[in-house]
Interface confidence: low
């Protein structure tokens, strides 16, 4: 998270962490008690799911494996298109005050929403700095209309922008599959953006949960 | 398959400026990285700085900063390279090569930083 | 700027052998580094990116393996058509960095 600040601790408590061994590999959000929704660009063949701090690699976090995920299959790695996934946990969480799913949209919200967007990924861009906690960024919801005109045809139908005018603030690197929470629902994963990140007024794109809650509840049955 | 295809060679006085050109064909051009990279004869690699299309910024090496210019014509599939106030280092071969593209998920894609190159345009500098 | 040291400058090997280079970023980068060959007169290609996966195409002789300072590109049993020039590059950070080249000659 570029410009950002450190998000109050326990304050998201559906925040998860994919590791990558000890490494971070990208943000995730707890829906279920064994399923994590993250964006479809994280997958690998298995994960190292941190559930319940806002430490990476804090010792007492809850740490569970999955070796399953399942892509939107409509995901395209040139546009970027239904960029969501569902990685489904080895062994069920254990739900605690540290540990809760995240609820699902009723509705999409509309521009001028506020939200806040969290994730460990880089706090600089180009060169990295990686943070031990959680850090958050409080950004809008940006029009469909005004977002084309600066992604022009790479914004799909699905995707979400999120910004705040001549901010920097923005999400980067490391923060992908993480959540975008607008009144308290989950409506965006973080997606993609500019690079270098955090250049003012080129918002950050997200998928937009609520076009997929469909897909989500649909794939959780199939592979109870 | 996607392919680049530059401009052909080059003389040039010292003092001069040169523009190379660098034209994609058969995929998908604007939101792909295009970086330029030089090779002297019979040195190495060298990042000049790069450019996504449908962001039109581009960003430069701190050694060419203010000779360099990178643009690129979304209409043409086109990028160009505008190299100014030549000398005699600057005799080398000019790469376009496509980058990753500008996603920045912890995907691996970013670890491809050149994955398809044109075929080069040298450019000699000599009075 | 991140400096790229690659060792050695260049190499003599025969047929068959296992061929091992080097590179060493100033600091870390993560795992965002490639490989690249380069032959006489021809523009370099990509084997190896995000210092381990193998570019389509590429044989599997190649492997990239490394993450965060120290990098290795190995050919596991070196064929004719692989005598050349080898590069590493990061992509970790701008402006994008490449180490110096090994020369992989016949013994």
């Known amino acids: 998270i570029i410009d950002g600040y450190k998000c109050k601790e326990g304050s998201h408590p559906w925040q998860v962490a994919l590791l990558k061994g000890n490494q971070l590999h990208c943000g995730g959000v707890l829906v279920d008690k064994y399923w994590v929704l993250t964006a479809a660009h994280c997958k690998m063949g298995q994960y190292q799911v941190q559930l319940g701090s806002d430490k990476i690699g804090d010792q007492s976090a809850q740490k569970i494996k999955a070796t399953k995920s399942f892509r939107h299959p409509g995901y395209s790695t040139k546009t970027h298109v239904n960029d969501i996934m569902l990685v489904r946990l080895d062994e069920p969480v254990k739900m605690s005050s540290k540990v809760e799913a995240v609820q699902l949209p009723e509705h999409c919200e509309p521009p001028g929403t506020s939200c806040t967007v969290s994730g460990w990924g880089t706090t600089t861009s180009p060169d990295v700095t990686f943070p031990s906690d959680l850090m958050c960024s409080d950004v809008k919801l940006i029009s469909s209309r005004e977002c084309k005109k600066v992604y022009k045809d790479l914004l799909g139908k699905t995707m979400l922008c999120a910004g705040i005018p001549d901010s920097k603030t923005n999400t980067c690197n490391g923060d992908s599959g993480g959540p975008l929470v607008c009144n308290d629902t989950l409506q965006g994963l973080v997606s993609w953006g500019t690079y270098p990140c955090g250049q003012p007024n080129d918002p950050g794109v997200y998928t937009q949960v609520c076009k997929y809650k469909r897909w989500v509840m649909e794939t959780m049955k199939t592979h109870r | 398959q996607v392919q680049l295809v530059q401009s052909g060679a080059e003389v040039k006085k010292p003092g001069s400026s040169v523009k190379v050109s660098c034209k994609a064909s058969g995929g998908t051009f604007s939101n792909y990285a295009i970086s330029w990279v030089r090779q002297a004869p019979g040195q190495g690699l060298e990042w000049m700085g790069g450019i996504i299309p449908i962001f039109g910024t581009a960003n430069y090496a701190q050694k060419f900063q203010g000779r360099v210019t990178i643009t690129a014509d979304e209409s043409t599939s086109t990028a160009y390279m505008e190299l100014s106030s030549l000398r005699s280092e600057d005799t080398a071969v000019y790469y376009c090569a496509r980058g990753a593209p500008n996603y920045y998920g912890s995907s691996s894609s970013r670890g491809i930083a050149f994955d398809i190159w044109g075929q080069g345009t040298m450019v000699t500098v000599s009075s | 700027d991140i400096q790229m040291t690659q060792s050695p400058s260049s190499v003599s090997a025969s047929v068959g052998d296992r061929v091992t280079i080097t590179c060493r970023a100033s600091?870390?980068?993560?795992?965002?580094l490639a490989w690249y060959q380069q032959k006489p007169g021809k523009a370099p290609k990509l084997l190896i990116y995000a210092a381990s996966s193998l570019q389509s195409g590429v044989p599997s002789r190649f492997s990239g393996s490394g993450s965060g300072t120290d990098f290795t590109l190995t050919i596991s049993s070196l064929q004719p058509e692989d005598f050349a020039t080898y590069y590493c590059?990061?992509?970790?950070?701008?402006?994008?960095?490449f180490g110096g080249g090994t020369k992989v000659e016949i013994k």
């Open positions: 590059v990061q992509a970790n950070a701008f402006p994008y960095t």
């Open positions: 600091q870390g980068i993560s795992s965002w």
